[in-house]
Interface confidence: low
């Protein structure tokens, strides 16, 4: 392997070691639990309520729940901190992917069933964009096998 690749890996590793990804994990877990409360157990169930989370335009807003809004302040704080953590990886897409993979690995044993795992994965993929950051184009978030595609 090229020397710069090794240096890049080391840099990413040290960034990952320094990063506190816990707020991201807390934010995502709260989010999928909130969604389950809204939709019932099935995250795919359609909702007729025009003000349900799926219809709410603020749902896709990187400021939602707003840091200026006291409602949902706990989740808001987690998201703020999470976005700041992910901002550290913005200039390195491969490392951003590694960070997302680490979040997935850390929480995989807390996810109850395939449905919740899929929902967590979906929210995790949206996380960089929610923070106004570039999402990695290819990022395998499967945790079953050790041989993931890291680009």
């Amino acid at each position: 392997r090229q020397q710069w690749e090794l240096q890049g890996d080391r840099r990413c590793q040290s960034q990952l070691e320094r990063a506190n990804l816990r707020p991201c994990e807390q934010h995502l877990m709260q989010k999928i639990q909130r969604d389950e409360d809204s939709y019932g157990r099935d995250p795919y169930s359609p909702s007729q309520d025009p003000y349900s989370p799926s219809q709410d335009p603020d749902r896709r807003d990187p400021y939602s729940p707003s840091p200026y809004d006291r409602r949902g302040a706990g989740s808001s704080q987690h998201q703020e901190r999470c976005c700041n953590e992910l901002n550290e990886f913005e200039n390195n897409q491969r490392c951003m992917c590694e960070a997302l993979q680490q979040i997935m690995e850390n929480q995989s044993d807390r996810l109850q069933g395939r449905q919740q795992e899929q929902q967590f994965k979906r929210e995790l993929r949206n996380l960089p964009q929610q923070c106004g950051l570039r999402a990695p184009q290819r990022c395998d978030l499967e945790v079953e096998s050790g041989g993931r595609d890291r680009y």
Epitope: Y63, P67, N84, G132
Partner: antibody
Amino acid sequence: QVQLVESGGGVVQPGRSLRLSCAASGIAFNDYTMHWVRRSPDKGLEWVAAISYGGTNKYYADSVKGRFTISRDSSKNTLFLQMDSLRVEDTAVYYCARDSGYRSLLHWGQGTLVTVSS
Amino acid sequence: EIVLTQSPLSLPVTPGEPASISCRSSQSLVHRNGYNYLDWYLQKPGQSPQLLIYMASKRASGVPDRFSGSGSGTEFTLKISRVEAEDVGIYYCMQALQTWTFGQGTKVEVN
């Protein structure tokens, strides 16, 4: 209560250096991107530089690139702006500001005046 | 670099009357997530700037509801429904899509 207090301003000759500090209290300093913004009578507000939460990413306005360096000391909750090769046009009140967690400048200090004059 | 152009640069106002400031961007401020990264700030005389509006239309905490922001892409507007004496100062728009840049400011003074 959020407090950002800038210091280090003063009168300096063109070509010389100055180091500004911004002491933060009442906020989770280590969780936020921090900024320096300046205001001069002729130019109004001008964003100068920003540094990400962990200090990995640093951003500069074209007008100061290569001359100014932003840094932070997380253990002391302090933000710095090292200003080298100062020019007359750098004369301004310099504010430090805390990012909202995304990209808005939510909390501001009271500012410190930098005058570059021969 | 994204350039923001504000108009008017000076705005005499009458308390109780509405006021409007325009901000035009040299390129679209819509992020791929669909949101406009444009803020409005007010710097009152002798004070530090304060955030009024973020993401083009969202009011910051504690900002009176007489302030509203609108617009998308390259054209944005800040409206004050009924100006009060305390609203005087310099209003700036700021883009946060590519690093950060401010408009040149609009000075609002009471007639």
